[in-house]
Amino acid sequence: AGHLEQPQISSTKTLSKTARLECVVSGITISATSVYWYRERPGEVIQFLVSISYDGTVRKESGIPSGKFEVDRIPETSTSTLTIHNVEKQDIATYYCALWEV
């Protein structure tokens, strides 16, 4: 079974800068899985943001601007990254990665 670790406990960024979050996959080949990213804003329900599937297909939540989030995966380090562009106060949240094993 696959295991996920998000090594960054927290990330502090200046407004308008870029934040990059990592999710390390172990126990399974990242190229054979789909990785999903969610966020939980304070006091709000958890929300799907974006996913990257085994074949590289990227899906994002409707209504999220196309340039706001980027998702990628690096097979060499078995890592998925979520990039948050133009960081705003509304981006303050806990970000979770999740795994779907194909």
Epitope: S53, G56, T57, V58, R59, K60
Partner: nanobody, 125 residues
Framework: EVQLVESGGGLVQAGGSLRLSCTAS????????MGWFRQAPGKEREFVAA????????YYADSVKGRFTISRDNAKNTVSLQMNSLKPEDTAVYFC??????????????????WGQGTQVTVSS
Amino acid sequence: EVQLVESGGGLVQAGGSLRLSCTASGRTFSSYAMGWFRQAPGKEREFVAAISWSGGTTYYADSVKGRFTISRDNAKNTVSLQMNSLKPEDTAVYFCAASLDCSGPGCHTAEYDYWGQGTQVTVSS
């Protein structure tokens, strides 16, 4: 609403090249991931290539890898498909399509919000 118009199709000999273009009008072009599909007579519509919202990621069907190149110009609202080393089996009607929420080879045709009318590509042997 987005209107997509393809151009650049035609008749070419095997081994030749064509460049297809798709021009979008309407809402912000960069909000859409773009894809090219093709449909040969009597066959299902199949994925050819796609490009992400920013243009930073491209995807190709195995049958066209190394021969076709997809690119986009968000300033000009266009996406192009450069097709080299064409083969008779590339003969089909080629469609461009736009998706707000999906980018890549796994996007179902239903995940594309807008489609062009298609342009015919014929490769003779």
